[in-house]
Amino acid sequence: MMTGTIETTGNISAEKGGSIILQCHLSSTTAQVTQVNWEQQDQLLAICNADLGWHISPSFKDRVAPGPGLGLTLQSLTVNDTGEYFCIYHTYPDGTYTGRIFLEVLESSVAEHGARFQIP
């Protein structure tokens, strides 16, 4: 029975040209994590395999860095990076857990204003 849950950073925004860390965390299970895939829509960005280490898709090599931990760092962000990202945890014996993160990449000034909102 799959008892685990994936916690993610949820919906996040970042500035164009900046970088962002995508993070997921698997909790409430003793299952062994054997592999974590990071996907953007239907594109495989990177895999971290417990035995084989990290492999970054060559198409994203210059803008994607492994880590920290099982997370993924996206660099030199463009507006085209806006969208859904998925962390897919392969575990033994539970099977597969999937987490979703929505990233919005904003023009610099918009991101700055968004960061200054106040609750009245």
Partner: antibody, heavy 117, light 107 residues
């Protein structure tokens, strides 16, 4: 088009070291992908040996640990296999290959190595 | 190590027929299975990865299926160039391992 070509001696004596070179053309070995060695024994069996990343870090088949070393020379766009303390059981056709997420999308033509005194 | 059990070891078929080769793994590899074709005296060529994704330039008469521990490669409407040996390989952990191969011969 990416091409890989293995080279090295066709005959090695038992207890000596086997050294092979894989030269890549049409793609830089520092531009992503992993770079693997695989061998094909006379009886049909294929065995993955290990790989080197573009960064230079390596992963080896545990069955060969202690005997195998994979290195690269990025200035000449080539990578190397060294297998120590060979026996006749290491007689095989040796292939280098390009790895994408640990499957092999480009293979060299292969070079046959015989271990015999 | 993940053991790969490929069957049959050999197979005879005629041009135009459909054949299926199977690969069973000793543990769950999810969808991380590749298939290669090797012709006599040549290097293996990637046909399929991630169970069912055809490699570039591979004809649509090849199709892969399965998940977990049971996988298959189907070749429909066999062509003369399809005869040779076929190998499965998991791409999920260390060591990466191959099946023992299936030799497809012309009947």
């Amino acid at each position: 088009d990416v091409q890989l070509q293995e080279s090295g001696p066709g005959m090695v004596k038992p207890s000596q070291s086997l050294s092979l070179t894989c030269t890549a053309t049409g793609y830089s070995i520092t531009s992503g992908y992993d770079w693997h060695w695989i061998r094909h024994f006379p009886g049909k069996k294929l065995e993955w040996m290990g790989f080197i990343r573009d960064s230079g870090s390596t992963v080896y088949n545990p069955s060969l640990k202690g005997r195998i070393s994979i290195t690269h020379d990025t200035s000449k766009n080539r990578f190397f296999l060294k297998l120590n303390s060979v026996t006749p059981e290491d007689t095989a056709t040796y292939f280098c290959a390009r790895g994408l997420f640990w499957y092999f999308d480009v293979w060299g033509t292969g070079t046959t190595v015989t271990v015999s005194s | 190590d993940i053991q790969m059990t490929q069957s049959p070891a050999s197979l005879s078929a005629s041009v135009g027929e459909t054949v299926t080769i199977t690969c069973r793994t000793s543990e769950n590899i999810f969808s991380y299975l590749a298939w290669y074709q090797q012709k006599q005296g040549n290097s293996p060529q990637l046909l399929v990865h991630n169970t069912k994704t055809l490699a570039e330039g591979v004809p649509s008469r090849f199709s892969g299926s399965g998940s977990g521990t049971q996988f298959s490669l189907k070749i429909s409407n066999l062509q003369p160039e399809d005869f040779g040996s076929y190998y499965c390989q998991h791409h999920y952990g260390n060591p990466l391992t191959f099946g023992a191969g299936t030799k497809l011969e012309l009947k």
